[in-house]
């Protein structure tokens, strides 16, 4: 991204109101605001010789106000000053960022690529959850309110977690389990989730939304071929008519004694009542 002020603009004595400008504070002049007004026509910027070159007021020392930006340290030289710049900066006043991808400027696992803009040395592509030119800022992912149905959002850094209210489930608390909460399916029924809704799968002999209603297992006439249905504490029993067998009397017994079943279960003869478990 372009620098805000004109490149090289003195960070101490210049400022800008428009991008690219370098406007000088009082007492300073020049394209980069590096020249003290009182000495701009002098051969020497300061010191005893100033009086002999027509300068009435000696200018400030080269290191006055520390002209070195970005934490650089200033040392005076016979005619000017010198900045010792910290790693990653260079230029007369340490104003130039020399950081490249080789310096590893992208934090939090950001991917560094060389900038397409000639004035941009690198660009960080940030991983989810981070932003800023160096991926240094954590995105407040919870501010997007990802947890539904009043769930509490927890940003764990590596992932988001939703702590769901009772009756809701799913990564974002999107499933409404309200009627299943607290064993809402009675009499041994089990709660089945499906498509964000729920239902109770009831044990035999029970029905209704919550499996609270007692059901007649023989009401649906489950025994085929004229078999007689008997309600039993653990289910229903079909007493088959002659010539039929099976839990629901669904298999005919052939005249030669063979049946359509591969074999009768051990301990059971064809024609015996079959318990449906």
């Amino acid at each position: 991204a372009p620098l805000v002020c004109r490149a090289g603009c003195s960070p101490e004595h210049g400022f800008c109101e428009q991008p690219g400008e370098c406007r000088c504070l009082e007492g300073w002049t020049g394209p980069l605001c590096t020249v003290p007004v009182s000495t701009s026509s002098c051969l020497s910027p300061r010191g005893p010789s100033s009086a002999t070159t027509g300068c009435l007021v000696p200018g400030p020392g080269p290191c006055d106000g520390n002209p070195c930006a970005n934490g650089g340290s200033c040392s005076e030289t016979p005619r000017s000053f010198e900045c010792t710049c910290p790693r990653g900066f260079y230029g007369l006043r340490c104003e130039v960022s020399g950081v490249t991808c080789a310096d590893g400027p992208c934090f939090n696992g950001g991917l560094c690529v060389g900038g397409a803009d000639p004035d941009s040395a690198y660009i960080c592509h940030c991983p989810p959850g981070f932003q800023g030119s160096n991926c240094e800022k954590r995105v407040d992912r919870c501010s997007l309110q990802p947890c539904r149905n009043g769930g509490l959002c927890l940003d764990l850094g590596h992932a988001l977690r939703c702590r769901c209210r009772a009756g809701f489930a799913g990564p974002r608390c999107e499933h409404d389990l309200d009627d299943c909460a607290g064993r809402a399916c009675a009499n041994g029924g089990t709660c089945v989730e499906g498509g964000g809704a729920h239902r109770c799968s009831c044990a035999l002999g029970f029905g209704g939304r919550d499996c609270r209603e007692r059901a007649d297992p023989c009401a649906a006439r489950p025994c085929a071929h004229g078999g007689r249905c008997y309600a039993h504490f653990s289910g229903l029993v079909c007493a088959c008519a002659p010539g039929y067998m099976g839990a629901r009397c669904e298999f005919p017994v052939h005249p030669d004694g063979a049946s359509a079943l591969p074999a009768a279960p051990p301990g059971l003869r064809p024609g015996d009542p079959q318990r449906y478990l």
Partner: antibody, heavy 119, light 107 residues
Framework: QVQLQQSGGDLMKPGASVKISCKAA????????IEWVKQRPGHGLEWIGE????????TYNEKFKGKASFTADTSSNTAYMQLSSLTSEDSAVYYC????????????WGQGTLVTVSA | DIVMTQSQKFMSTSVGDRVSVTCKAS??????VAWYQQKPGQSPKALIY???YRYSGVPDRFTGSGSGTDFTLTISNVQSEDLAEYFC?????????FGAGTKLELK
Amino acid sequence: QVQLQQSGGDLMKPGASVKISCKAAGYTFSNYYIEWVKQRPGHGLEWIGEILPGSGSTTYNEKFKGKASFTADTSSNTAYMQLSSLTSEDSAVYYCARWGAREPGFPYWGQGTLVTVSA
Amino acid sequence: DIVMTQSQKFMSTSVGDRVSVTCKASQNVGTNVAWYQQKPGQSPKALIYSASYRYSGVPDRFTGSGSGTDFTLTISNVQSEDLAEYFCQQYNNYPLTFGAGTKLELK
């Protein structure tokens, strides 16, 4: 990448005016000074002045005040220099250049526009 | 105005030589000096800024030095493509001013 494309050369009559254009591409035009430089054989390079397109603020070399005037059109990313009351002394190649961003000075230059003033 | 004096209008050199082009400012300009190379019929090309920093893409055989009033552009291991005119420029004070140029020629 940064590119500066200048208008073609002109043969002008003394006393006339000429307007040279410099079309910029590859960067944010508003944010960087466009510099204007004159070059005559045997006279080296002379800085005429500069304009910051975003604000329209200009700085002229005293020597060229009244001779050159700068404008910029941010909608077309084009800077202009008008030279008035032309004389044979104004016959020269005129360059536009762009001030550096991280690197002070004139790292980017147009190809130059030759202005010839002759009766 | 600050006068940038390039005392040598011409310098002779051979391929592989080391050559130094000098520039003297009429007053202290800190290190706010740039160097440019220009070949006949071409626009100037930026080489050095802040007296000693190479612009991107400039071969490292070009080095700049100096501060205050005395500046030098050194070309080590001169190549045939380096035969051109070299200008110094100060951007410490308005108006920005250039040296008159030094033309590098083959011996």
